[in-house]
Amino acid sequence: PEPPTACREKQYLINSQCCSLCQPGQKLVSDCTEFTETECLPCGESEFLDTWNRETHCHQHKYCDPNLGLRVQQKGTSETDTICTCEEGWHCTSEACESCVLHRSCSPGFGVKQIATGVSDTICEPCPVGFFSNVSSAFEKCHPWTSCETKDLVVQQAGTNKTDVVCGPQDRLRA
């Protein structure tokens, strides 16, 4: 038979032979030959390979460096890498989560639209008319202005995006 030019899924071509790839969690020790099947060995402690492969070395698990504000979210296995996340109040600077920065606070006049997670920063939005925020916060949303009418009071000072309205008693001298 003619030597193959292409191999099946989970195989690779070497020396005109189709060899089995090593399964996730194992590395290649020896290519298959005319006489032998591919030889694979499990990855060691703190190593992984996450695909069918012909790698002769496993990858090291990611280290979640506490000095960079990182902690382990999910421990790695022989088939998966460690997943890092950030300590409370911090979030990852990139998708790879290699370092952390403090969550952003929303300035007065802005409220929190979406609270930060370990992997995403705080999303702020300007307080629309009828709402305000008078603090710098990573948690506070824009609050609605106080409704003076429901308290049987009148607006003495109009609200802004940073301040609430000021209510006062109704002027009883008026007709």
Partner: antibody, heavy 115, light 112 residues
Framework: QVQLVQSGAEVKKPGASVKVSCKAS????????IYWVRQAPGQGLEWIGG????????NFNEKFKSRATLTVDTSISTAYMELSRLRSEDTAVYYC????????WGQGTTVTVSS | DVVMTQSPLSLPVTLGQPASISCRSS???????????LHWYQQRPGQSPNHLIY???NRFSGVPDRFSGSGSGTDFTLKISRVEAEDVGVYFC?????????FGGGTKVEIK
């Protein structure tokens, strides 16, 4: 071209040890196992075992496991087979062989065990 | 260990005529990967063995097409379609499916 060149003939006394070498050339030494096979006079072949030069990993015929030692020196692309506690039945031609993209044999090393 | 039994022990042949050697294994040589690791080789007097066929029916590079292999499971055959003078020697089968690898006792092919 691929070549396996073995060390010369040996004469040993019973109880002694012998170390046969197999120098490889013409290919990347660490890419293929080296296997050892022997053939007693007028007899068939017997598989001793193999060694992976990449990591020193071995597999053996259980019959030889306690007496045979397989090693490599990757700096000089050479494999070694040492057989200890020799007896007269170990008199044979010892071959090293490599397969993968063809099969290659050394020229053989005659080991004679005699008192 | 897997026992490999070859027959006949000796095979006198006429030049230009076909020859056939049988090899039986004591257990199946079908590997879990779907391959059957049964091989044939020739040894001329005073020489190292020379492989002819691997995995039942695949000829090594440079092996004349008068050599062919067939079989499956435990029953295998090497055929020489027209024997030539250079074909004299001992023919061995071997298996590398199971450890330890084992060999047949050999079949001596000689010209009548």
């Amino acid at each position: 071209q691929v070549q396996l060149v073995q060390s010369g003939a040996e004469v040993k006394k019973p109880g002694a040890s012998v170390k046969v070498s197999c120098k490889a050339s013409g290919y990347t030494f660490i890419s293929y196992y080296i296997y050892w096979v022997r053939q007693a006079p007028g007899q068939g072949l017997e598989w001793i075992g193999g060694i992976n030069p990449r990591n020193g990993g071995t597999n053996f015929n259980e019959k030889f496991k306690s007496r045979a030692t397989l090693t490599v020196d990757t700096s000089i692309s050479t494999a070694y087979m040492e057989l200890s506690r020799l007896r007269s039945e170990d008199t044979a031609v010892y071959y090293c062989t490599r397969h993968g993209n063809g099969v290659y044999w050394g020229q053989g090393t005659t080991v004679t065990v005699s008192s | 260990d897997v026992v490999m039994t070859q027959s006949p022990l000796s095979l006198p042949v006429t030049l230009g005529q076909p020859a056939s050697i049988s090899c039986r294994s004591s257990q199946s040589l079908l590997h879990s990967n779907g391959n059957t690791y049964l091989h044939w080789y020739q040894q001329r007097p005073g020489q190292s063995p020379n492989h002819l066929i691997y995995q039942v029916s695949n000829r090594f590079s440079g092996v004349p097409d008068r050599f062919s292999g067939s079989g499956s499971g435990t029953d295998f055959t090497l055929k020489i379609s027209r024997v030539e003078a250079e074909d004299v020697g001992v023919y061995f089968c071997s298996q590398t499916t199971h450890v330890p690898w084992t060999f047949g006792g050999g079949t001596k092919v000689e010209i009548k």
